[in-house]
Interface confidence: low
Amino acid sequence: DWVVAPISVPENGKGPFPQRLNQLKSNKDRDTKIFYSITGPGADSPPEGVFAVEKETGWLLLNKPLDREEIAKYELFGHAVSENGASVEDPMNISIIVTDQNDHKPKFTQDTFRGSVLEGVLPGTSVMQVTATDEDDAIYTYNGVVAYSIHSQEPKDPHDLMFTIHRSTGTISVISSGLDREKVPEYTLTIQATDMDGDGSTTTAVAVVEILDANDNAPMF
């Protein structure tokens, strides 16, 4: 039973530190006094001192808040030795998994996206794709899952719903007929990316859609 199940620790913990996580215990302590130690990145190698162990009790200690976006998993080794320094157990693998908090906002890859579409196209025509990233976890949680939306369109002509955006892919498409370069040569969309699949933090960017001439007006002489 010289085994420890993977330990989950939320990032950005408020403490107080040091915080007891789990207890290493060798059943050889019935026969002799045991001293415990840990090695590995996060203990005795960079980043040193994140984790420590109470030498006599075996309590594994966390000394400071963790950042999942910096290190998502620590692999340490636990050691048990007798008073005379002889190893009484094989080194034990200790996995510490840092669980995600929604501590990052989405970020658009550009402040301004530019695209173009031919005037008079049918609804459903794709115009461009925008992208936002979020450093938080998007596999086990929704913290880093981004949902896209259009907040506003200017000008609002012929009306304010000329475009739509796919909430998952960020693809902007024409949703209404009536694009006419002679009337409106360019639309400015304020787009939003919201994490937690639409229920979290929001960031904003701009998508500029140029309406291209379809040569529907004969030149006048």
Partner: antibody, heavy 123, light 106 residues
Framework: QVQLQQSGPGLVKPSQTLSLTCAIS??????????WNWIRQSPSRGLEWLGR?????????DYALSVKSRITINPDTSKNQFSLQLNSVTPEDTAVYYC?????????????WGQGTLVTVSS | DIQMTQSPSSLSASVGDRVTITCRAS??????LAWYQQKPGKAPKLLIY???NLQSGVPSRFSGSGSGTDFTLTISSLQPEDFATYYC????????FGQGTKVEIK
């Protein structure tokens, strides 16, 4: 650099029309990348955006709901200026009125302002 | 309409002090926020746009932060010319201003 110069009367009688003009130098009222705004400031209402015009191959305007039924903002391309008309004024409309330029549609704030005109509504 | 609430409404400070003014929006506005400085008898002057971008020509002692609903304007070391009234303004949905924060000499 862009400058805005305001002109217009400082005293207007109740129920009459308030008229102000904002002359633009260093830019064009027909710029495809600017919006031209009117904003007012009073002790009771603070800073209040009233409306704007902008040109994108044709003229567009947007007005604040609080004044929408009474306001008109017009461009004058020949004089490179734009004007504010506010009808049926009451003493509540007493304020310092500013014109201001917004980059694009105003997404970067109002960087250029006129000097302000104190308009008093009183008989 | 989106309401903008500033705090405090006034504060007294000395030259060299670090001054912080906060602004809260009635709904999330992402980073679509500007800060202005106004001196008596003058038009407002743009200091910060997009919540944290310093307007050209504005001293670096001014900085802005925040996103969503809560925003902060910080003056790292107050100078004599900084005594004025400061306004926040949102531009996500039309344009609305905070009620102002007057920074006075202690």
């Amino acid at each position: 650099q862009v400058q805005l110069q305001q002109s217009g009367p400082g005293l207007v009688k109740p129920s009459q029309t308030l008229s102000l003009t904002c002359a633009i130098s260093g830019d064009s009222v027909s710029s495809q990348s600017a919006a031209w705004n009117w904003i007012r400031q009073s002790p009771s209402r603070g800073l209040e955006w009233l409306g704007r015009i902008y040109y994108r191959s044709k003229w567009y305007n947007d007005y604040a709901l609080s004044v929408k039924s009474r306001i008109t903002i017009n461009p004058d391309t020949s004089k490179n200026q734009f004007s504010l008309q506010l009808n049926s004024v009451t003493p509540e409309d007493t304020a310092v009125y500013y014109c201001a330029r917004g980059e694009g549609y105003g997404r970067e704030g109002f960087a250029i302002w006129g000097q302000g005109t104190l308009v008093t509504v009183s008989s | 309409d989106i309401q903008m609430t500033q705090s405090p409404s006034s504060l007294s400070a000395s030259v060299g002090d670090r001054v912080t003014i906060t602004c809260r929006a009635s709904q999330t506005i992402s980073n679509t926020l500007a800060w202005y400085q106004q001196k008596p008898g003058k038009a407002p002057k743009l200091l910060i746009y997009a919540a944290s971008n310093l307007q050209s020509g504005v001293p670096s002692r001014f900085s802005g932060s925040g996103s969503g609903t809560d925003f902060t304007l910080t003056i790292s070391s107050l100078q004599p010319e900084d005594f004025a009234t400061y306004y926040c303004q949102q531009y996500l949905s039309w344009f609305t201003f905070g009620q102002g924060t007057k920074v006075e000499i202690k």
